[in-house]
């Protein structure tokens, strides 16, 4: 959508993040163990022949799958693609990993297992030591730390070289909190849940994570259809029924990495009013600098005008007036039976001299009233170091 200013294009967020070209230093590569110093973590760079040609763990990865290679990107990145190889060893290496799992963290404390859109965790790896196998991560992960867990179906040696591809997560969004998305019953069920949310879900509330509202995928005009192949109706949208909210609004909370001056929030909404989806009638946001602090000043209120009869999906821009905060709470007012969002992003600037939140920790409990919320897209640094992105070819091994 041309009207999504600052919205990143996930198809272009595919730059090598620095294993192969060594912009990721050795000190940011570690492992649970190494077979020897010559197969230490620092030898895990894609296409490198350093040492004995790869990282190889000391222990067996069968049956426990506890050995891992860790890459610390130092800042939050959207990781859209990974590449793996086996051990080089001057062409004599025989060790590679046929499959692996990924875990990732934004704060170094809470680790999430990556899953594809159908809940599958195991990623197909290499069939030989030298070939590079690229895996498109759908959904991508917002991470600072990534761990590769090689797998085997029997006791055997496995070794690994890796690269990560993506771009800097400039938005700074650490998590959003929202009520659980609901099912709309038409002639078929339309599942408007946040199916890639990586935080916690309890008591009708999702908190401490990111999901489809921050994945860069903008929904279609017909919310029953999707950009993705082989997914269920409603996949691109998260939605709530007005009948579920006595308050008349859905409330969301957003946590950022550091103090930011917020210029605007952009919410990509469906407006297929013939099936009950309507743009919000208005948005009200409030701001605070810390999780235990009071909300500051008056809320920013924005009533939505425009061509509400036009059934096309669109980005709604909510001005935030340069307000400084690390936490935002926004209420989206119902103007019809359903609110359906596919993305939420923020245009903001880091406030100079603000230090990052401690890993972006999550509060012990929600501290806001009820309702559903917004989410975010990210404005990303798209072209680090003048590289070209890794292309995505339909039907290629990266699909």
């Amino acid at each position: 959508d041309a009207d999504m200013k600052g919205h990143f294009d996930p198809a272009k967020c595919r730059y090598a993040l620095g294993m192969q070209d060594r912009t990721i230093p050795d000190s940011d590569i570690s492992a649970s163990s190494s077979w020897s110093d010559s197969t230490a973590a620092r030898h895990s760079r894609l296409e490198s022949s350093d040492g004995d040609g790869a990282w190889c763990p000391a222990g067996s990865v069968f049956p426990k799958e506890e050995e891992y290679l860790q890459v610390d990107l130092q800042r939050l990145h959207l990781v859209a693609l990974v590449g793996t190889q086996g051990r080089h060893a001057g062409g004599l290496g025989k060790e590679f990993s046929r499959s692996y799992r990924l875990r990732y963290s934004r704060d170094g404390r809470r680790w999430m297992g990556w899953k594809d859109r159908w809940g599958q965790e195991v990623i197909s790896g290499n069939e030989d030591p030298e070939g590079v196998v690229l895996k498109d991560l759908g959904p991508p992960m917002v991470a600072r730390l990534v761990r590769f867990y090689p797998r085997a179906d029997r006791v055997m040696s496995v070794c690994l070289r890796v690269e990560l591809y993506g771009c800097l997560w400039r938005d700074g969004l650490l998590s959003y909190t929202a009520p659980v998305g609901q099912t709309m019953y038409l002639s078929e069920a339309v599942y408007l849940n946040d199916s890639t949310y990586d935080g916690h879900t309890v008591g009708g509330l999702q908190y401490g994570g990111l999901g489809q509202l921050a994945d860069g995928v903008v929904g279609l005009d017909d919310f029953r259809k999707s950009q993705e192949l082989r997914v269920w109706p409603g996949y691109d949208y998260v939605g709530w029924s007005n009948h579920s909210f006595s308050s008349g609004y859905v409330e969301m909370e957003f946590e950022f990495d550091r103090l930011r001056a917020f210029q605007a929030m952009q919410v990509h909404c469906n407006n297929m009013h013939t099936l009950g989806a309507r743009l919000p009638g208005g948005v009200e946001c409030r701001f605070r600098r810390g999780p235990a602090m009071a909300w500051e000043g008056e809320p920013m209120r924005h009533n939505l005008g425009g061509n509400l009869g036009d059934p096309r999906a669109r980005a709604v821009s909510v001005p935030l007036g340069g307000r400084v905060a690390r936490f935002l709470q926004c209420r989206f007012l119902f103007a019809g039976p359903w609110l359906l969002f596919s993305e939420i992003s923020f245009i903001s600037d880091v406030v100079n001299n603000s230090s990052p939140a401690l890993g972006g920790t999550f509060p012990p409990a929600p501290w806001w009233p009820p309702g559903p919320p917004p989410t975010n897209f990210s404005s990303l640094e798209l072209e680090p170091r003048g590289q070209q992105p890794v292309a995505k070819a339909e039907g290629s091994p990266t699909a």
């Epitope: 609901q182 009708g204 009948h243 409990a365 929600p366 009233p369 009820p370």
Partner: antibody, heavy 121, light 107 residues
Framework: QVQLVESGGRVVQPGRSLRLSCTAS????????MLWVRQAPGKGLEWIGT???????YYASWAKGRFTISRDNSKNTLYLQMNSLRAEDTAVYYC???????????????WGQGTLVTVSS | DIQMTQSPSSVSASVGDRVTITCQAS??????LAWYQQKPGKAPKLLIS???DLASGVPSRFSGSGSGTDFTLTISSLQPEDFATYYC?????????FGGGTKVEIK
């Protein structure tokens, strides 16, 4: 194990006040919408009120002003303060936890055993 | 305030019968409806949320349908353990009234 235990029910005279408690174990109360529901002898279920995870409260129209729901997160306990009690408030009082099913809609999946309040002179 | 009206207030049936209980809301509530079963001296038990969604462990002979203002709970083949009182509830994030209940008795 995950459970809710109500306490504080007793015989009380009309016009007096009473506070009921509901102590949660196995989960944090402040992550959930929590409800108080009552049932008079031989009658149906009657919703009294709800407190959200953000401490917003909702009440049945007949309960507004006389009944107050609160929560002490440090004790993981939910309260129902009842004032100016009347004979028709005689009932078993339940606390319950709202959870979402697979389709995202709420239902009361966890209930306490109930505590009996008898209002009589 | 939304009111929930259940009918019938009681029904006599035999094991194996198909039993239908209806619940009507005073205004549209979309799909925001739950059903409960309660036996004497016990707390209610959740059967269905969101009109259709069976709670964990609930037998498939129970099913829900409807939308807007009119809803139905159906027990396809009544079992001895199903004799109880059934309640519908409008349960949004907020005000949550119950229906008056339907007692399913042995004929």
């Amino acid at each position: 194990q995950v459970q809710l235990v109500e306490s504080g029910g007793r015989v009380v005279q009309p016009g007096r006040s009473l506070r009921l408690s509901c102590t949660a174990s196995g989960f944090s109360l402040n992550r959930y919408y929590m409800l108080w529901v009552r049932q008079a002898p031989g009658k149906g279920l009657e919703w009294i009120g709800t407190i959200s995870y953000g401490d917003t409260t909702y009440y049945a129209s007949w309960a507004k002003g006389r009944f107050t729901i609160s929560r002490d997160n440090s004790k993981n306990t939910l309260y129902l303060q009842m004032n100016s009690l009347r004979a028709e408030d005689t009932a078993v009082y339940y606390c319950a936890r709202a959870d979402t099913g697979d389709n995202g809609y709420l239902g009361l999946q966890l209930w306490g055993q109930g505590t009996l309040v008898t209002v009589s002179s | 305030d939304i009111q929930m009206t259940q009918s019938p207030s009681s029904v006599s049936a035999s094991v194996g019968d198909r039993v239908t209980i209806t619940c009507q809301a005073s205004q549209s509530i979309g799909s925001v409806l739950a059903w409960y079963q309660q036996k004497p001296g016990k707390a209610p038990k959740l059967l269905i949320s969101g009109v259709f969604d069976l709670a964990s462990g609930v037998p498939s002979r129970f099913s829900g349908s409807g939308s807007g203002t009119d809803f139905t709970l159906t027990i396809s083949s009544l079992q001895p353990e199903d004799f109880a009182t059934y309640y519908c509830q409008y349960i949004p994030y907020g005000s949550s009234p119950f229906g008056g209940g339907t007692k399913v008795e042995i004929k």
